[in-house]
């Protein structure tokens, strides 16, 4: 396993519909062709994993039907998008980028984006 | 080195509004917020909002809200903060400070004051 | 919107004591965001501490900070001249960003 350097916003502030999108970026130390993209999330001490996609460069990332994350790639850079978040998914998001195929294995981690999400504010009562 | 330099000194009437701008470098401005703090004189730090310079959201603390507006100048790493129907008691230092997430850098401060 | 508190409001020492000061939040500052800035007169806010316990980039090692959930602490080990000032807590876990109204340290 190699060490390879990816780069992330540190921090973003989610739209008020609760979509955030950031780029991560990797240093690609040769031609990969298959690259494995997972977003984790960090708060109070706990990691989980919110969505991974693998994908063959020059195609789109496939997430899972049910996965809140979308992505597309160029080059070395894989733009994400989080969407459905809410004030409570507040935290570090930290992008881990796999190089598969061909080998060697390449592995690298991001230092996280901070994504803070704001709950819209109820609207007043109206009589109307 | 990271810096933020504020612009100069303000005196406005009431009613009027002041845009006080925040020029950052020594870092990739995108990649982090700017908030604003004031402090009125003889007071504590009062958050004002911040704006994610990476896509321009904003969130503003309540009491501000419909009378201040956050921007940033990607293209020359620069943050702006107007104050819209200024009152006597918005006299007080603003500062910038970088989000990351910390405060961890500070503008100068630029005094505005508000007096007929 | 969390409150934070912070007490004593002054704390009236005499260089070389220890300082301790307290900041509570009015519920569970996320995964303990939570800084410590001090303040002289006519200058900017500095920051101190970060994520409750780790000290800033040039802030020696007499500050120490502590604490997690909604109860946090600063401590001045041995007080020097520089260090009579107004510190402030600040929460960054969630936005709205707050901070706490401040203690002053002054020389006895």
């Known amino acids: 396993c190699k060490a390879m350097h990816v780069a992330q916003p540190a921090v973003v502030l989610a739209s008020s519909r609760g979509i955030a999108s950031f780029v991560c970026e990797y240093a690609s130390p040769g031609k990969a062709t298959e690259v494995r993209v997972t977003v984790l999330r960090q708060a109070d001490s706990q990691v989980t994993e919110v969505c991974a996609a693998t994908y063959m460069m020059g195609n789109e990332l496939t997430f899972l039907d049910d996965s809140i994350c979308t992505g597309t790639s160029s080059g070395n850079q894989v733009n994400l998008t989080i969407q459905g978040l809410r004030a409570m998914d507040t935290g570090l998001y930290i992008c881990k980028v796999e190089l598969m195929y061909p080998p060697p294995y390449y592995l690298g981690i991001g230092n996280g984006t901070q994504i803070y999400v704001i709950d819209p504010e109820p609207c007043p009562d109206s009589d109307f | 080195q990271v810096q933020l330099v504020q612009s100069g000194a303000e005196e406005k009437k009431p009613g009027a509004a002041v845009k006080v701008s925040c020029k950052a470098s020594?870092?990739?401005?995108?990649?982090?917020?700017i908030s604003w703090v004031r402090q009125a004189p003889g007071q504590g730090l009062e958050w004002m909002g911040w704006?994610?310079?990476?896509?321009?959201?904003?969130h503003y603390a309540q009491k501000f809200q419909g009378r201040v507006t956050m921007t940033t100048d990607t293209s020359t790493s620069t943050a702006y903060m107007e104050l819209r129907s200024l009152r006597s008691d918005d006299t007080a230092v603003y500062y910038c400070?970088?989000?990351?997430?910390?405060?961890?850098?500070w503008g100068q401060g630029t005094l505005v004051t508000v007096s007929s | 919107e969390i409150v934070l508190t912070q007490s004593p409001g002054t704390l009236s020492l005499s260089p070389g004591e220890r300082a301790i000061l307290s900041c509570r939040a009015s519920?569970?500052?996320?995964?303990?965001?939570l800084a410590w800035y001090q303040q002289k007169p006519g200058q900017a806010p500095r920051l101190l501490i970060y994520?409750?316990?780790s000290r800033a980039t040039g802030i020696p090692d007499r500050f120490s900070g502590s604490g997690s959930g909604t109860d946090f602490t600063l401590t001045i080990s041995r007080l020097e001249p520089e260090d009579f000032a107004v510190y402030y807590c600040?929460?960054?876990?969630?936005?709205?960003?707050?901070f706490g109204p401040g203690t002053k340290v002054d020389i006895k």
């Open positions: 400070a970088r989000v990351g997430p910390p405060f961890d850098y």
């Open positions: 020594g870092y990739t401005f995108t990649s982090y917020g």
């Open positions: 704006i994610s310079a990476y896509n321009g959201n904003t």
């Open positions: 519920q569970s500052v996320s995964s303990n965001y």
């Open positions: 994520g409750a316990s």
């Open positions: 600040q929460q960054y876990g969630n936005s709205p960003f707050t």
